[in-house]
């Protein structure tokens, strides 16, 4: 069963799935100026059996100007920069998550993919949160969210995480300010939702975010 909506948004935090449950769909979206090859499916699908899971179908993008060819164009330096975070492969993926039965790893990048990935999660999926560079975590509980089915409807549990600016007066649990809806926040703040291919250690993530801030997309 697909989750009806997205994981909750926490101001100044990113979320990430360490592994994707079977049934998860990933849209094959291409960056501007490129399109999916005509024969290609619109999705990658995490499928498998009890012993092995993998992504069905491969996403491929071709230049919009080239009608009947799948010739790939090498990204320009600025294009490489904008996708830098997506393309990082971390050696730090926890073994227990990556090798979970019935789960797929993060799919490798494909040439000229869009700067955000659009995932469609399934019930039982867990995502993990951490604060972006310049903010520190005040935990009241687990910094994770799970898609659950209750009374025939899907919902994400609320992660117990507050990200506070290091230079601000500390905001302690119990003093939490009301959160504005995601659409109510300024665009610059919304775009702080950054997701890497795998969680990096904080310093590595901070360094990355100085050069590239964008959202890896989930839906």
């Amino acid at each position: 069963e697909l989750c009806d909506d997205d994981p909750p948004e926490i101001p100044h935090a990113t979320f990430k799935a360490m592994a994707y449950k079977e049934g998860t769909m990933l849209n094959c979206e291409c960056k501007r100026g490129f399109r999916r090859i005509k024969s290609g499916s619109l999705y990658m699908l995490c499928t498998g059996n009890s012993s092995h899971s993998s992504w069905d179908n491969q996403c491929q993008c071709t230049s919009s100007a080239t009608r009947n060819t799948t010739k790939q164009v090498t990204p320009q330096p600025e294009e490489q920069k904008e996708r830098k975070t997506t393309e990082m492969q971390s050696p730090m993926q926890p073994v227990d998550q990556a090798s979970l039965p019935g789960h797929c790893r993060e799919p490798p990048p494909w040439e000229n993919e869009a700067t955000e990935r659009i995932y469609h999660f399934v019930v039982g999926q867990m995502v993990y949160y951490q604060c972006v560079q310049g903010y520190r975590a005040l935990h009241r509980g687990p910094a994770e969210s799970v898609c659950k089915m209750t009374h025939g409807k899907t919902r994400w549990t609320q992660p117990q995480l507050i990200c506070t600016g290091e230079m601000e007066t500390s905001q302690f649990p119990g003093e939490e300010k009301p959160q504005a809806s995601p659409e109510g926040r300024p665009e610059s703040e919304t775009s702080c939702l950054v997701t890497t291919t795998d969680f990096q250690i904080q310093t590595e993530m901070a360094a990355t975010m100085e050069t590239s801030i964008f959202t890896t997309e989930y839906q």
């Epitope: 009806d4 909506d5 997205d6 948004e9 849209n27 979206e29 291409c30 501007r32 999916r36 005509k38 499916s41 619109l42 999705y43 179908n57 869009a114 700067t115 955000e116 659009i118 469609h120 995601p182 659409e183 919304t190 959202t215 997309e217 989930y218 839906q219």
Partner: antibody, heavy 115, light 107 residues
Framework: QVQLVQSGAEVKKPGSSVKVSCKAS????????INWVRQAPGQGLEWMGR????????NYAQKFQGRVTITADKSTSTAYMELSSLRSEDTAVYYC????????WGQGTLVTVSS | DIQMTQSPSSLSASLGGKVTIACKAS??????IAWYQHKPGKGPRLLIH???TLQPGIPSRFSGSGSGRDYSFSISNLEPEDIATYYC?????????FGGGTKLEIK
């Protein structure tokens, strides 16, 4: 609960343009995929195109390429579909729908093209 | 573009009975098919996606099956509120295409 609310009915002259809006509530609009579909009187459903607001990516059906423009305003959680060079055969009910399998639909907007 | 051939275009059945609608794609659509119920003056309603996944809140009287190019949709134990036009949609390929629709009437 996700809701898509569309703008009201329009009467247009041939050769003019129409812009239909679709305001979303519930969920995170920028992460939506918004599709536009139309149904002419006595006809079936016809996909026109889609937009992914956070990507700024639009895709259009070949039939409408060059005549339809789909946009989105993240600040107001609203998607728009503009159809230009209207002709009488564009008289139809226009719908917006979420996701690629159209899980939630707007109530529809009747556009009448008549001289 | 992928063509979706839906049959029959109309059908009539008795209350409590069962009906089946077929959709044939012009190429393999990898199970990415959805089924909708459309009543006059309303927006269509998603019943089933990914061939057989029932949308939350949709009764189990509705079901879907198929693979490759051939797919079917059934309603059992027909009720008066099932009177509507039903459409299939392929969403495997970005140029999404609907079937021509099946108008269901109750005898």
């Amino acid at each position: 609960q996700v809701q898509l609310v569309q703008s009201g009915a329009e009467v247009k002259k041939p050769g003019s343009s129409v812009k239909v809006s679709c305001k979303a509530s519930g969920g995170t609009f920028s992460r939506y995929i918004i599709n536009w579909v139309r149904q002419a009187p006595g006809q079936g459903l016809e996909w026109m195109g889609r937009i992914i607001p956070i990507l700024g990516v639009e895709n259009y059906a070949q039939k409408f390429q060059g005549r339809v423009t789909i946009t989105a305003d993240k600040s107001t959680s609203t998607a728009y579909m503009e159809l230009s060079s209207l002709r009488s055969e564009d008289t139809a009910v226009y719908y917006c729908a979420r996701k690629d399998w159209f899980d939630y639909w707007g109530q529809g907007t009747l556009v009448t093209v008549s001289s | 573009d992928i063509q979706m051939t839906q049959s029959p275009s109309s059908l009539s059945a008795s209350l409590g009975g069962k009906v089946t609608i077929a959709c044939k794609a012009s190429q393999d659509i990898n199970n990415y098919i959805a089924w909708y119920q459309h009543k006059p003056g309303k927006g269509p309603r998603l019943l089933i996606h990914y061939t057989s996944t029932l949308q939350p809140g949709i009764p189990s009287r509705f079901s879907g099956s198929g693979s490759g190019r051939d797919y079917s949709f059934s309603i059992s134990n027909l009720e008066p509120e099932d009177i509507a036009t039903y459409y299939c949609l392929q969403y495997d390929n970005l140029l999404f295409t609907f079937g021509g629709g099946t108008k269901l009437e109750i005898k």
